[in-house]
Amino acid sequence: KSPIFGPEEVNSVEGNSVSITCYYPPTSVNRHTRKYWCRQGARGGCITLISSEGYVSSKYAGRANLTNFPENGTFVVNIAQLSQDDSGRYKCGLGINSRGLSFDVSLEVSQGPGLLNDTKVYTVDLGRTVTINCPFKTENAQKRKSLYKQIGLYPVLVIDSSGYVNPNYTGRIRLDIQGTGQLLFSVVINQLRLSDAGQYLCQAGDDSNSNKKNADLQVLKPEPELVYEDLRGSVTFHCALGPEVANVAKFLCRQSSGENCDVVVNTLGKRAPAFEGRILLNPQDKDGSFSVVITGLRKEDAGRYLCGAHSDGQLQEGSPIQAWQLFVNEESTIPRSPTVVKGVAGSSVAVLCPYNRKESKSIKYWCLWEGAQNGRCPLLVDSEGWVKAQYEGRLSLLEEPGNGTFTVILNQLTSRDAGFYWCLTNGDTLWRTTVEIKIIEGEPNLKVPGNVTAVLGETLKVPCHFPCKFSSYEKYWCKWNNTGCQALPSQDEGPSKAFVNCDENSRLVSLTLNLVTRADEGWYWCGVKQGHFYGETAAVYVAVEERKAAGSRDVSLAKADAAPDEKVLDSGFREIENKAIQDPRLFAEEKAVADTRDQADGSRASVDSGSSEEQGGSSRHHHHHH
C-alpha cells in the first residue's frame, strides 16, 4: 500500500475553495522530491495540474497553489473558485505520476444553493455581522415583523417587532424597519457563531396574506493561512478584522489542543512569557487592523495562531478571527548566533547580527525592546551615522565582518543595559534577530584610566592594559564617532604590571596624542580583535583644557580604579531627535524607519545576536559636557 495519505473524499460547492493536505513519510529523499496533484483520466492516465517544481496547468492558472512543508512531511494543494467541472478523481503524490507513491482523492463540487426556492444565501465569516433583508407588501406595513430559524422540523422565533429576542441572540441582534418609503425590514446579527448557521424565514404579517422570505445563512470558520518561516527568523501576522471592531481589544492567541487559545499578546497588556523580548504588537489603524511581529522563531513556535477582537482580549464565542498555521523551517538560511550575550558591569559586549547577504547595502539598525504597553523597539544606532544621544561614546555599529554579518559594540555596561535587543535592516524583514544581554558579576579585563584631561598643544599618552588571555589578539586604539571608531597608531610598551598572576604575555599599549588640539576631545576606545571579529573594548573620555603648566601628560591607571559610574547623562548633553522602531519596517513593509520621539530611559543600551556567550570588557562611564 502507498505510504501517502490524504482525504479520500472532498465535498464542496461552486465558488468555494478547498485546501487538500497530503501526508508523506518525511525522509530526506521524500522531503525534496517532486510533489504533484493530477487528475485521473477515463483511460487511467493522470494529467498533472500543479507540481512543486512550478508547473501550473492553464485550468488552474491564478486559482491554485501547491506548498511543500518538508519539516512536517506534508504538502498542501489550495484550489479556489471551484466549479462543477472540477468534480472528479485526483491523485496527490511524490515523484513521477505513474509511480505508486500517490493517494486517490475524490473531489465533488455541487451547485451552490443560490436562489433556489426563493432562498437568499448569506455567506459570512465567523464573528462578523450579517444583515438579512426582508421585503414585504404595503398591506403588511403595519403588521408584526418576525424572523424564525428552522430547527429540525420546527421554526423557532428569533426576533420580532414587538420586542421579543431569543435568548441565544441576546445583545447581538436587532430588527430595523426602514422608512415608510421602503417596504423592507432587516435583521442585523452581530458576532456570528457557527451555531447561527442554518435556514431562516422572515415574515411580515401573521395571516394567510403574510409575506415570507427564506434565507440560508452560512457561517464560515476561516481556513488558516499557511505561513512558512525560517528558524531564528521573524514572522509578521497582519490582522484586518474590519472597522466595526476598531475600538474593541485585539489579541493574538495560539491554539493548544481542545478549545483553549492561549493569549500570546493582546492590547490589554497581556503577553506570554515565552515571547518576552521578541514580540511587538503595533498600534492599530483606524480601520481596526493591526500587526504582530515575532522574532527569533523557535521550533516550538510552530502551530495555529488566531487573531481576533473581544473586550476580554481573548478568544470568545462570536469573536471575529483570522487564522494562520505557522510552520518553522529548521533548514534555516539564518545562521545560528547567540541568543544570550553576557557582559561584566563596566565592561563591554560585541554582538554579531546576521542579515541577508544579498542586501549588503541595506541600512542596519539596532534597537532596544521595551515591554511596556504592546511592546516597542526604539532605535539606538544605525549604519548611516545616527546614534541615540544617550549612547554617544559607548555604542558603535560596524559593517564588519560583512558578507551577511554586522557587529554592534556596547561598552561602559551598567545593570540598566540588561534586556532584549533586536538586529534588523531596512531590507528583508524576515531577518530580524533578538539577543538578550545579561550583566554578570566580574571585573573588566581591559584596564584604562577614568577621567583624562589633555592640555592644548601638549602631548598626551593614555595607557590600556591587556591581560595575558588576549596575547594572541590584535590590540588597537581608536577614536569613537557616530559612524564608527577610527583606528589610531598605538605603541606596545611591553608587559603590564596591572595584573596579578599574569605573565609576560600581558601588554601595555598606549595611545599618544601629539600637540593636542580641541579636535582631540572625545571618546577613545582600546580593544581587541581577531581579524574582523571584535572582542572586548574599554572607553576613555579625553577632555581638552587650556595650558596651565608646561610638559607632556602621562596618565597612570591609579587615577581610574573607581567602580563603574551609573549616572544618567548630564542635562548639558545635546539631545538629538530619537528614533523608534514601531510603525516602520517592523510593521509596514513599505515605510522607511521613521523618526519619532522616544521617552525611554536614556541610560540603557542594546545589542542583537543569539546562544550563551561570555564576554568581558572594560570601560568607565564618566560623562563630560561636549
Epitope: F5, P7, S17, V18, K221, E223, S257, E259
Partner: nanobody, 126 residues
Framework: QVQLVESGGGLVQAGDSLRLSCAAS????????MGWFRQAPGKEREFVAT??????????YYADFVKGRFTISRDNAKNTVYLQMDSLKPEDTAVYYC?????????????????WGQGTQVTVSS
C-alpha cells in the same frame, strides 16, 4: 467543554451492517473535525475515519482497512457524526470511540484530538 456521546454499537453477524452515532454537546464552536477510533482487546487504539469541515466544504479521511466498507457523515443541525459500517468482519470487533478536535494536523494521530467519548462496543461474530 465539549461532550461526546456514542451510540449504536451492538452484536452483529459477519457481513451485517451497523450505524454508529456520536452526538456533540456543550461549547462546540471551535470544533474543526470529528472522527472515529477503535480499540480491540490487547491492542492500541487506532484511527478509523475522520470528517473535517470548513463552511460548506468537508473532507473525509479513512484508514486503509475500512475503505469501501465504512462511510463517515455528519448532520450539522444535530451536531452529530455517523459511521455507517457495512460488510462487517470479526476483526472489526472493538470499542469504537468518537473524538473531536479544534486543530487538525494529521487526522490519524490520537494526540490531535482533545475530546473523547466513552466508547461503544461493536462485536462481530463469525
Amino acid at each position: 467543554q465539549v461532550q461526546l456521546v456514542e451510540s449504536g454499537g451492538g452484536l452483529v453477524q459477519a457481513g451485517d451492517s451497523l450505524r454508529l452515532s456520536c452526538a456533540a454537546s456543550g461549547r462546540t464552536f471551535p470544533t474543526y473535525a470529528m472522527g472515529w477510533f477503535r480499540q480491540a482487546p490487547g491492542k492500541e487504539r487506532e484511527f478509523v475515519a475522520t470528517i473535517r469541515w470548513s463552511g460548506s466544504t468537508q473532507y473525509k479521511y479513512y484508514a486503509d482497512f475500512v475503505k469501501g466498507r465504512f462511510t463517515i457523515s455528519r448532520d450539522n443541525a444535530k451536531n452529530t457524526v455517523y459511521l455507517q459500517m457495512d460488510s462487517l468482519k470479526p476483526e472489526d470487533t472493538a470499542v469504537y470511540y468518537c473524538a473531536a478536535t479544534t486543530l487538525l494536523g494529521d487526522p490519524r494521530a490520537l494526540n490531535e484530538y482533545a475530546y473523547w467519548g466513552q466508547g461503544t462496543q461493536v462485536t462481530v461474530s463469525s
